[in-house]
């Protein structure tokens, strides 16, 4: 029998040499085909995300498809041979007879493959979305936990203030918030989470112990501690949180705030509408600046905070969200931004020269024994300053957002709700400039930093959503804010790096800035961080404040700085609106900068702990930050300014009447900003119920070893 069996040939009967190919038709046709190489399709190889099942299905389909193609190829060959009159054997004939079937199967398999590939992609997308969602949820949980830690640190820290203690014992409405016993418990607990430096232990170890206490408190464990349990302590702390005591306006400025009221009185009470370009609000120039502490927390009167959404969030919530944002954004080279005095009375001087004179006058006043000039001023030209911290575009003259008033204005009732660019600075509260500073819907007619005037009660609870929404400054948010000149909107400069921390200012990612490439010099040297990440961060701060952590692989442990509430002030410029402010690599101010005080993002390094009594000499060191080369810099050098006396610079040496060696002051380890003198160190200096001398640093050493995420 012609073995028609296996060949499927068709052709010429028995005569003639076997088809040379040995394609024994039938089989080939049968498609049995040797094992086709398994799925070569890209889809099948997407493995990682794809479920195993989908992978296998695609593999099978792929193999089948290739077998069918191979089979069809043979059938075509057989038919061709048949057409030439060549005899096919039975197998080949059988195969040829199935030509249509094979063709149909092939089409079907292709369709199936397409469907499964699409399905596979959908699955992948779904898995990615799910993973992302889970990641966001995890991040959110972490942020909440961090927020709680910061709140806790703030509260514990504040409890060192006698006035606060008294208030809490007396209660706001006569109802005591805490008993003496509870205060004592918190004092005891404070010693655990802010331990004296034990040189027999490694710092790491010491804070590890402290962090365990904090953790157990957060968990509300039933474990005993300080003669009670963490659970009880947690309830006590929560009671304090819920009392909103710290959200209302209390004039506890962590130290001296001597004639605040008088000082800020001259501030214009009502905002000048945008149309009136230069209401000459004056900087109240006080010679007591040195002895004054600045309250960074409560800047803006409620009326001035015209956010799109009016829901209110407990200011704690917001501030910590912001702190978290900034922490998460801790750049690898977290520039040592330090809190600036934030009570600003916007002044729009008509003449740049006048403004410059005013600045110089202020500087002169600040030349007292404390050498008050902030490094941040100097750092503006300092290469060590993080390139990400760049100055903002010159302000539109119409923006009443002038220089910070370097005095301690009354804190009145502006709540601590995260003002742009600032996490509230409690007397020694952790202040981290908000990376996600956004122009929370500030209307154009209102300066970003309002003079702290009347005691307008700021809504206590701005919904976190709202903050988050404004934090994200998505394009939908730009309605109110876009009326501000681009420069006036707080910015998180995340151009090339993920190091916006501490550099509050204009959110370049906000829609209004999308087209303003000139605002920042994208070529400024920055450490090689995941640039694409940061560039993508347009919508990063969304309703769930889900910043991606990927932009900074190592979180610089800036808890120190956080404690310092590193805040920066948007130096409001009154340059012409069209001046695009190009920041060069060395952070020089552009020539157009008409202002005398061109400090957009000037970190002030607030030495919180000093008020506690002791010097915080080591602060700077502990707070080393990553310099431009991503190398860890000790705090001292990191904060040393270098004057670049460029003509553009708002500060040339000549501007200061007395030459001073700023670097010397920097070596103290903390910026001169709030170096307290021999004046009263504020209630915080008091021993706070503990025996022995006052703790030098009640400000919770920030758990330096604890990574945020």
């Amino acid at each position: 029998m012609p073995s028609a069996t296996s060949h499927s040939g068709s052709g010429s009967k028995s005569s003639g040499p076997p088809p040379p190919s040995g394609s024994s038709g039938s089989e080939a046709a049968a498609g049995a085909g040797a094992a086709a190489p398994a799925s070569q399709h890209p889809a099948t190889g997407t493995g990682a995300v794809q479920t195993e099942a989908m992978k296998q299905i695609l593999g099978v389909i792929d193999k089948k498809l290739r077998n069918l193609e191979k089979k069809k190829g043979k059938l075509d060959d057989y038919q061709e041979r048949m057409n030439k009159g060549e005899r096919l054997n039975q197998d080949q004939l059988d195969a040829v007879s199935k030509y249509q079937e094979v063709t149909n199967n092939l089409e079907f398999a292709k369709e199936l493959q397409r469907s499964f590939m699409a399905l596979s992609q959908d699955i992948q997308k779904t898995i990615k979305k799910t993973a992302r969602r889970e990641q966001l949820m995890r991040e959110e949980a972490e942020q909440k936990r961090l927020k709680t830690v910061l709140e806790l640190q703030y509260v514990l820290d504040k409890l060192g203030d006698d006035e606060v203690r008294t208030d809490l014992k007396q209660g706001l409405n006569g109802v005591p918030i805490l008993s003496e016993e509870e205060l004592s418990l918190l004092d005891e607990f404070y010693k655990l989470v802010d331990p004296e430096r034990d040189m027999s232990l490694r710092l790491n170890e010491q804070y590890e112990h402290a962090s365990i206490h904090l953790w157990d408190l957060l968990e509300g464990k039933e474990k005993p501690v300080c003669g009670t349990t963490y659970k009880v302590l947690k309830e006590i702390v929560e009671r304090v949180f819920q009392s909103n005591y710290f959200d209302s306006t209390h004039n506890h400025q962590n130290g001296l705030c001597e004639e605040e009221e008088a000082a800020s009185a001259p501030a214009v009470e009502d905002q000048v509408p945008e149309a009136e370009p230069e209401p000459a609000e004056e900087y109240t120039e006080q010679s007591e600046v040195e002895s004054t502490e600045y309250v960074n927390r409560q800047f803006m009167a409620e009326t001035q905070f015209t956010s799109g959404e009016k829901e209110q969030v407990d200011e704690w919530t917001v501030e910590t969200v912001e702190v978290v944002n900034s922490l998460q954004q801790q750049p690898q080279a977290a520039s040592p931004s330090v809190p600036e005095p934030h009570s600003l009375t916007p002044v729009a001087q008509a003449d740049p020269l006048v403004r410059r004179q005013r600045v110089q006058d202020l500087m002169a006043q600040m030349q007292g024994p404390y050498n008050f000039i902030q490094d941040s001023m100097l750092d503006f030209e300092n290469q060590t300053l993080d390139p990400a911290i760049v100055s903002a575009q010159p302000m539109n003259p119409t923006q009443n957002m002038d220089m910070p008033q370097l005095v301690c204005p009354p804190v009145h009732s502006e709540s601590r709700l995260a003002q742009p660019n600032q996490v509230p600075v409690q007397p020694e509260a952790t202040q981290v400039p908000l990376v996600s500073s956004t122009s929370e819907g500030y209307t154009a007619s209102q300066p970003l930093y309002q003079p702290s005037h009347a005691t307008e009660q700021r809504p206590q609870k701005e919904p976190i959503d709202q903050i988050q929404a404004t934090i994200s400054l998505n394009t939908d948010q730009t309605t109110a804010s876009s009326s501000l000149p681009a420069a006036s909107q707080p910015q998180v400069f995340q151009a090339g790096t993920s190091k916006p921390l501490h550099s509050s200012g204009i959110n370049v990612n906000a829609a209004p800035f999308q087209s303003m490439q000139t605002v920042f010099n994208m070529n400024a040297p920055v450490p090689p961080v995941n640039e694409p990440e940061t560039l993508k961060q347009q919508n990063q701060y969304q309703a769930s404040y889900n910043q991606s952590f990927s932009s900074q692989p190592h979180q610089v442990e800036q808890t120190e700085l956080q404690q310092e509430q590193l805040q920066t002030v948007v130096g409001t410029y009154h340059g012409s609106p069209d001046q695009s402010h190009q920041v060069t690599g060395n952070h020089q101010q552009p020539p157009q900068q008409n202002t005398g005080f061109p400090r957009s993002n000037q970190p002030y390094y607030n030495s919180r702990g000093v008020s506690r009594g002791g010097s915080r000499g080591a602060r700077g060191l502990m707070n080393g930050y990553r310099g431009p080369a991503n190398g860890f810099r000790g705090g001292y050098d990191g904060y040393r300014p270098s004057f670049s006396n460029t003509p553009n610079s708002g500060y040339t040496q000549s501007q200061f009447s007395a030459p001073r060696d700023y670097s010397g002051y920097q070596r103290d380890g903390y910026q001169q900003n709030f170096k307290r003198g021999s004046g009263q160190s504020g209630p915080r200096g008091a021993p706070r119920g503990r025996g022995g001398p006052p703790r030098p640093n009640r400000g919770m050493p920030q758990m330096n070893t604890q990574q945020v995420n």
Partner: antibody, heavy 111, light 112 residues
Framework: SLEESGGDLVKPGASLTLTCTAS?????????MSWVRQAPGKGLEWIAY???????TAYANWAKGRFTISKASSTTVTLQMTSLTAADTATYFC??????WGPGTLVTVSS | DVVMTQTPASVEAAVGGTVTIKCQAS??????LAWYQQKPGQPPKRLIY???NLDSGVPSRFKGSGSGTDFTITISDLECADAATYYC??????????????FGGGTEVVVK
């Protein structure tokens, strides 16, 4: 299926015609119908095939002249055997191509 | 006609073992070769066609290979049911030359 018939006990020198009947299909153009035999305890031996499409036939060298394969109808193929000898004693199978086989029919040549 | 020579005539192997049977054609037949399994009292059952293609329903333990004049079938993971006689057959049909569809002599596989 296929079924062979016509097997019998015959004397040497006799002739015999075997028939292969198809059920469930008819012999259309694309089939080779073959005959194969197997002597008791021996191996398979191909005899001949016919290509139904054009009636072309092929035979094993040893079968030429004594065996003839033909298509009798759309469902039957026959094998005519002449001058049988004892060596022709075997089970005869018909097959379509080489895939489908009948159960075989026994031909015994004996005196 | 082409002559097919099959070796060995008989082979014994244990369950789970492997058996290889060879078939040699007297002239090149390309890949026109089929392998059959036959058990006593039954007609042959084709296992492989075109030298290496498995018929449907045949376990993949059966593997055919070769082309031209030398062919082999390998049965791995032997099972008791594999005990049978195996044949090779030339399945070439060509108008120019008559190859004939000769069978090999067969190989008996005994499974212990």
């Amino acid at each position: 299926s296929l079924e062979e018939s016509g097997g019998d006990l015959v004397k040497p020198g006799a002739s015999l015609t075997l028939t292969c009947t198809a059920s469930g299909f008819s012999f259309s153009g694309s089939y080779y119908m073959s005959w194969v035999r197997q002597a008791p305890g021996k191996g398979l031996e191909w005899i001949a095939y016919i290509y139904i499409g054009d009636g072309v036939t092929a035979y094993a060298n040893w079968a030429k002249g004594r065996f003839t394969i033909s298509k009798a109808s759309s469902t039957t193929v026959t094998l005519q055997m002449t001058s049988l000898t004892a060596a022709d004693t075997a089970t005869y199978f018909c097959a379509r191509g080489n895939k489908l086989w009948g159960p075989g029919t026994l031909v015994t040549v004996s005196s | 006609d082409v002559v097919m020579t099959q070796t060995p005539a008989s082979v014994e192997a244990a369950v789970g073992g492997t058996v290889t049977i060879k078939c040699q054609a007297s002239q090149s037949i390309s890949s026109y070769l089929a392998w059959y399994q036959q058990k006593p009292g039954q007609p042959p059952k084709r296992l492989i066609y075109d030298a290496s293609n498995l018929d449907s329903g045949v376990p993949s333990r059966f593997k055919g290979s070769g082309s031209g004049t030398d062919f082999t079938i390998t049965i791995s993971d032997l099972e008791c049911a594999d005990a049978a006689t195996y044949y090779c057959q030339c399945t070439a049909v060509s108008s120019a030359t008559i190859y004939g569809n000769a069978f090999g002599g067969g190989t008996e596989v005994v499974v212990k």
